[in-house]
């Protein structure tokens, strides 16, 4: 049922664009219009435990499509990737190292907060351009899964799995503090 495993139809990944090594910066400014009405950032684990986690934020850039229309500019997206702990390395029978979680809680690297970005779509045949707001991942987190979580949260969150099911719309996730305006404006 989840949206993270799916994306809009026909996308075009542009190699070499937007492959930033660092995650986007956070903006800690006070939210001003609704007295901190935004959802607070999520802190799923203590700082001392961070070394046990490897939830990565990968960037890739692509054009978006909506039916026959295509975004005027490519959009840089963030994809959540990697394993989450707490986990420890154990050698397996043939000497290789593998992750092992002994009957513990299942943690996954999934989107934490989302942001909207305006996208202008150009359409063929002289049709009028369209303006849409696209839902983009703003940050990732390691989240403990329970049996109540959606099946989608058990999937990998990368561009390879980012395809919609026919007749289904992908689904959003939580969002928190105000998105970085510079990131919104300079995403291209």
């Amino acid at each position: 049922q989840g949206w993270q495993a799916f994306r809009n139809d026909a996308t075009e990944v542009i190699p070499g664009l937007g492959e930033y090594p660092e995650p986007p910066p956070e903006n800690n400014q006070t939210m001003n219009r609704a007295e901190n009405g935004g959802r607070p950032p999520h802190h799923p684990y203590d700082a001392k435990d961070v070394s046990e986690y490897s939830c990565r934020e990968l960037h890739y850039t692509r054009f978006l499509t909506d039916g026959p229309c295509r975004s005027a500019k490519p959009v840089t997206e963030l994809v959540c990737s990697g394993q989450c702990g707490p986990a420890r390395l154990l050698p397996n029978a043939i000497g290789r190292v593998k992750w092992w979680r002994p009957n513990g809680p299942d943690f996954r690297c999934i989107p934490d907060r989302y942001r909207a970005q305006r996208v202008q779509l150009l359409c063929p045949g002289g049709a009028a351009p369209r303006s849409r707001k696209v839902r983009l991942v703003a940050s990732c987190k390691c989240k403990r899964l329970t049996r109540f979580h959606n099946q989608s949260e058990l999937k990998d969150f990368g561009p390879e799995t980012a395809r919609p099911q026919k007749g289904r719309k992908p689904r959003p996730g939580a969002r928190g503090a105000k998105a970085n305006q510079a990131e919104l404006e300079n995403a291209y």
Partner: antibody, heavy 121, light 109 residues
Framework: EVQLVQSGAEVKKPGASVKVSCKVS????????MHWVRQAPGKGLEWMGG????????IYAQKFQGRVTMTEDTSTDTAYMELSSLRSEDTAVYYC??????????????WGQGTLVTVSS | QAVVTQEPSLTVSPGGTVTLTCGSS?????????PYWFQQKPGQAPRTLIS???DKHSWTPARFSGSLLGGKAALTLSGAQPEDEAEYYC?????????FGGGTKLTVL
């Protein structure tokens, strides 16, 4: 499929406050952009405020600024709209409405059944 | 704050075509106002017909279409049916703020 179920009708005295709830099922509340809209008897729709995903914050209509508070309890997937300093002209049906999820934002796709708030002395 | 204007009432014959418009006190309505159109029948909650100027929903009858016409958002109903008699509201986004129009009472007779 998102479903929104609102709390029951309320009768309040002028000057009092009312808190209307909107229980989300089908999705979790944190996955949706919630807005509140009201409609006075025989009148049109009036937007009160809602979550702006572009700015990452809740925005209130200027008319209700300082008098309305929109909150969320993500543990119970319930949104709340509290309106204070009630006056007779606040008598209306209050609706919660959310987007449908999705890669492209489509707001106001799902509506609660409405909560009638009557302000009368 | 911006004011969004609609025709207070319109009448269309069954099978006929009618266009409802949605204007802004701030000037021309563009795709960046993300016009929405809603249908509301007595005693019911509103129902979204059109999002983002022209985007129909799975439940939107094909006879409804959205566009921009002459600096306004427009909802065109082609081949009106008796069940289309209702109140129609438009909505425009001004940044993060939302403003509804006053509504158009559409009569089919």
């Amino acid at each position: 499929e998102v479903q929104l179920v609102q709390s029951g009708a309320e009768v309040k005295k002028p000057g009092a406050s009312v808190k209307v709830s909107c229980k989300v099922s089908g999705y979790t509340l944190s996955e949706l952009s919630m807005h509140w809209v009201r409609q006075a008897p025989g009148k049109g729709l009036e937007w009160m405020g809602g979550f702006d995903p572009e700015g990452g914050e809740t925005i209130y209509a200027q008319k209700f600024q300082g008098r309305v508070t929109m909150t969320e309890d993500t543990s119970t997937d319930t949104a709340y709209m509290e309106l204070s300093s009630l006056r007779s002209e606040d008598t209306a049906v209050y609706y919660c409405a959310t987007d449908a999820g999705g890669y492209w934002y489509k707001f106001f796709q799902h509506w609660g059944q409405g909560t009638l708030v009557t302000v009368s002395s | 704050q911006a004011v969004v204007t609609q025709e207070p009432s319109l009448t269309v014959s069954p099978g006929g075509t009618v266009t409802l418009t949605c204007g802004s006190s701030t000037g021309t309505v563009t795709i960046d106002h993300y016009p929405y159109w809603f249908q509301q029948k007595p005693g019911q909650a509103p129902r979204t017909l059109i999002s983002d100027t022209d985007d129909k929903h799975s439940w939107t009858p094909a006879r409804f279409s959205g566009s921009l016409l002459g600096g306004k958002a427009a909802l065109t109903l082609s081949g009106a049916q008796p069940e289309d008699e209702a109140e129609y509201y438009c909505l425009l986004f001004y940044g993060g703020t939302v403003v509804f129009g006053g509504g158009t009472k559409l009569t089919v007779l």
